[in-house]
């Protein structure tokens, strides 16, 4: 089979699987399409997987190149390592498997890099332009578990056809993962559809055995049943529903469990109760009653802006004090009249891409669980500790679900590894500490309060970020009305020992938004609540200094909260490290864990420690945490993040955000 | 060494077509993608389309609204360009040249070859 | 479509100067950016590819630099053989490669 061919094709092992999309995208644009997908740019880092890598890209042209999940920012160059500085888009450098097209060359590494994989050949890996439009990208789908592919039987009329979670359809997978669809036709004309389900007794495997095709019991009129009718194999018939469809209680009709609207924002068949609920990007489900949707507040998430950030339904904005600015990533400031540039293009095209419609978005592969179970890492799926996914799924697939991306697309990216966007689908570990600084931001003066804008305007239809389900872990979201916060960059600790490992850490129980990539976790988080501003009438805003009591009953109000961070064992076995190289032979590199330098987050500022409010313990090793892609350049003024397909209601004007509500939330994630 | 040689130059009426070649030489020709690109006189380069060798598979500049057709021969190692309804905004020289695909451990594609260019001159 | 604007479009300089071109785009490009050098006649020669990788056999006088949009070209001690035509080009979105007007620079 042609890889190049039109269409994508996909090779499965027992707990993971390799998609192969020969589709033309930037590193960003791949990035976003596995994630939408339910899955990650490859990752190969062991021989093994390497070798399925192999197998799948086959012998290409020379002339076609591969994204996978590599990149490096600038500046961050570490030759003597085997990923050479680069980082996994999982988040971590750990790996047993290299094979740089290369050796390793001194350098500056002054621009951003990411990795594309040569089609022919070797399949080595090339270093280049992160916005290049390649010709194709490399998924990679973990799941809990596969079925083997079925046996053919005597009375098939075909092979068995199968699709997967992530909407590849093919006859010729080995496995296949939890959550896929086989379609068996039989000569005698009638069909059986088995799904890959999760087995009473553990483990995963098809909803029902063999044989498939025998019997004439559903012939006449479809044995009674309104939708599909399946022969036993004890002879008598059973009646099923079509995706969408539960079985009434006379077993033979189906009912539409979302018919009577149990969910606030979006239900979707499937799970314990015939239904789930879902909530669209910015809210998550409430705690007390997973049918409705509240929010979060992005401004409690240090680092978020670096000034001011405002908060509202479903969204929040960045903004600068007086005689600042904000940047291009609409998220730094910087002295005002300073050079920079400014990318042309406003955020709704350039986050808000693809032009999906939201009935199109609604019927992606977008929860694999009932209910409101919360997964820690469909995107980061790995052997070595699988996410628990519940089934919830629809075997009807639309004939091409990979994401479509108008071409060119701009390449304005959202900042890749950074603390910003509230994109969604993020899987994000929170098992770093932060250290706040303690000196004081620069604060507009009450005479010339900083100019907010008093409306939030909606966006239209085609630049609207996709609903997300809630069954994926909740995202930081906005529902506190307008609370203005002053938030720190996050810093590095200072003397946190390395650490490498095979495992991801565990992600915060149900309920508890982890935080956005590269966040890290504050023990203190300063936030500062203004009192109500009239409408169309900036803030003014003061702040405390690291010791400064409140000095008047209307000052901001410094809230503590004390975060209980998991502690990992900082005692890690050492990895193996095999290279692939044209120049010289398979060679095993070992790279101990106690001489590996932490993977740190990207792009932090430069900060004293003088500056840090709390001393970190050594005993929070780094976390791997996930990272968006970023790609070089300016992004957009100012950030605005509205999370469904439908208008919310923001408010029109400050004033009625009512910013004098202190609201007391459960805060515990932050 | 990688060459790419040019046909001769061409003086053509308006209305009619052109069809240059571009041969190749020193490496595999279905490894590397071949663009063609013009330059009018006191003007700026101007991309108008490519053809991977490999498979066929071709793009166009939007901008020549479906007058320009690329194809190759892989025997010859040959590319070539077809040019219709010619105007005198259409004189200029056309290059081809061949789009790199790595070059020290990076993938890159700038193009690392060109051919010396076909003068087309459109005049009644 | 992405513009490229070159400054200057003219220049005069003498053996030894050291010279800079700047390329500006009209948006986000990356390091998807390439400089050409033409000589009256003759195709246009690879310098710089990816922003800042000096071609095989190109002088190291020769040095690129920037990304996003902003680019410059910089000749750090100019040769006779260095007087000719310069364009940058981006394909960020490729294939639709675009290029500069040109910078010419003359013997002073």
């Known amino acids: 089979q042609d890889p190049w061919a039109a269409e994508p094709r996909s090779a499965c092992g027992p707990s993971s699987c390799y998609a192969l999309f020969p589709r033309r995208r930037t590193f960003l644009e791949a990035w976003r399409a596995c994630r939408e997908l339910g899955g990650d740019l490859a990752t190969p880092r062991t021989p093994e997987e390497a070798q399925r890598v192999d197998n799948l890209v086959g012998a290409g042209p020379a002339s076609r190149l591969l994204w996978i999940g590599l990149q490096r920012q600038a500046r961050q160059c570490q030759l003597q390592r085997p990923l050479r500085g680069f980082t996994w888009t999982t988040g971590d450098q750990d790996t047993a498997f290299t094979n740089w097209a290369q050796p390793a060359t001194g350098g500056p590494c002054p621009a951003q890099r990411c990795v594309a994989l040569e089609a022919s050949g070797e399949h080595r890996w090339l270093e280049g332009s992160c916005t290049l439009a390649v010709d194709g990208y490399l998924c990679q789908f973990g799941f809990e578990g596969a079925c083997p592919a079925l046996q053919d039987e005597a009375g098939q009329a075909g092979p068995a056809v199968y699709t997967t979670p992530f909407h590849l359809v093919s006859t010729e997978f080995e496995w296949l993962p939890f959550g896929s669809v086989a379609a068996v036709q039989c000569q005698a004309g009638r069909g059986a559809s088995l799904l890959c389900v999760k087995q009473p007794e553990g483990g995963v495997g098809w909803s029902r055995a063999g044989p498939l095709c025998l019997g004439a019991g559903c012939s006449p009129d479809n044995g009674g049943c309104e939708h599909e009718c399946v022969e036993e194999v004890d002879g008598h018939v059973s009646c099923r529903c079509t995706e969408g469809f539960r079985l009434a209680a006379d077993g033979r009709s189906c009912e539409d469990p979302c018919a009577q609207a149990p969910c606030e924002q979006q239900c979707e068949p499937g799970g314990p109760q015939g239904y789930s609920c879902h909530c669209r990007l910015g809210f998550r489900p409430a705690e007390d009653d997973p049918h409705r949707c509240v929010d979060t507040d992005e401004c409690q998430i240090a680092g978020v802006c670096q000034q001011m950030c405002v908060n509202y339904v479903g969204g929040f904005e960045c903004y600068c004090s007086e005689g600042h600015e904000l940047e291009a990533d609409g998220i730094s400031c910087s002295p005002a009249g300073a050079m920079g540039a400014r990318a042309s293009q406003d955020l709704g095209d350039e986050l808000l891409d693809d032009g999906e419609d939201e009935e199109d978005e609604d019927e992606a592969w977008e929860a694999f669980g009932g209910g409101w179970t919360e997964m820690p890492g469909i995107l980061w799926m790995e052997p070595t500790q699988p996410p628990d996914f519940a089934l919830a799924y629809r075997p009807s697939f639309p004939e091409d679900r990979e994401p479509q991306i108008p071409y060119p697309e701009p390449t304005w990216p959202p900042p890749l590894s950074a603390p910003r966007v509230p994109y969604h689908s993020s899987v994000l570990s929170v098992t770093r500490p932060v250290v706040v600084s303690a000196t004081r931001p620069t604060l507009p003066s009450a005479h010339q309060p900083p100019v907010i804008p008093a409306t939030h305007p909606a966006l239209s239809r085609d630049h609207q970020i996709p609903v997300i389900a809630a069954n994926y872990p909740d995202l930081p979201s906005a529902y506190q009305p307008g609370i203005l916060s002053v938030s720190h960059p996050a810093q590095p600790p200072a003397h946190q020992p390395p650490m490498i490992s095979t495992r991801y850490p565990e992600l915060f129980p149900a309920h508890q938004s982890p935080m956005f990539p590269d966040t890290q976790v504050a023990g203190t988080q300063t936030t500062t609540h203004l009192p109500a501003i009239p409408p169309n009438r900036a803030p003014l805003v003061t702040t405390l200094g690291a010791h400064q009591p409140p000095q008047a009953p209307d000052a901001p109000v410094l809230r503590t909260q004390a975060t209980q961070l998991p502690i990992i064992p900082t005692a890690q076995p050492s990895l193996t490290t095999s290279s692939r190289s044209p120049v010289s032979p398979a060679h095993q590199v070992s790279v101990p864990a106690a001489t590996q330098p932490p993977a740190l987050p990207t792009l932090l500022p430069s900060q004293s420690p003088t500056n840090q409010t709390s001393p970190i313990s050594p005993t929070h090793p780094h976390s791997k945490v996930p990272q968006i892609p970023r790609e070089d350049g300016p992004s957009p003024k100012l950030a605005l993040w509205l999370p469904s397909a439908a208008p919310t209601a923001a408010p029109t004007a400050l004033g009625e955000a009512s910013l004098a509500e202190h609201i007391q939330r459960d805060d515990r994630w932050l | 060494q990688v060459q790419l040689v040019q046909s001769g130059p061409e003086v053509m009426k308006p209305g009619a077509s052109v069809k240059m070649s571009c041969k190749a030489s020193?490496?595999?020709?279905?490894?590397?993608?071949i663009h063609w690109v013009r330059q009018a006189p006191g003007k700026r380069l101007e991309w108008m389309g490519y053809i991977n060798p490999y498979d066929d598979d071709t793009t166009y500049n939007q901008k020549f609204k479906g007058r320009v057709t690329i194809t190759v021969d892989k025997s010859a190692s040959t590319a070539y360009m077809e040019l219709n309804s010619l105007t005198s905004e259409d004189t200029a020289v056309y290059y081809c040249a061949r789009r790199g695909n790595s070059y020290d451990g990076y993938f890159d594609y700038s193009m690392d070859y060109w051919g010396q260019g076909t003068l087309v001159t459109v005049s009644s | 479509d992405i513009q490229l604007t070159q400054s200057p479009s003219f220049m005069s300089a003498s053996v030894g100067d050291r010279v800079t071109i700047t390329c500006r785009a009209s948006q986000n490009v990356g390091t998807a950016v390439a400089w050409y050098q033409q000589k009256p006649g003759q195709a246009p020669k690879l310098l710089i590819y990816s922003a800042s990788n000096r071609y095989t056999g190109v002088p190291s006088r020769f040095s690129g630099s920037g990304s996003g949009t902003e680019f410059t070209l910089t000749i750090s001690s100019l040769q006779s053989e260095d007087f000719a035509t310069y364009y940058c080009?981006?394909?960020?979105?490729?294939?639709?490669?675009?290029f500069g007007q040109g910078t010419k620079l003359e013997i002073k």
């Open positions: 020193g490496y595999t020709f279905t490894d590397y993608v």
């Open positions: 080009q981006q394909y960020t979105n490729y294939p639709m490669y675009t």
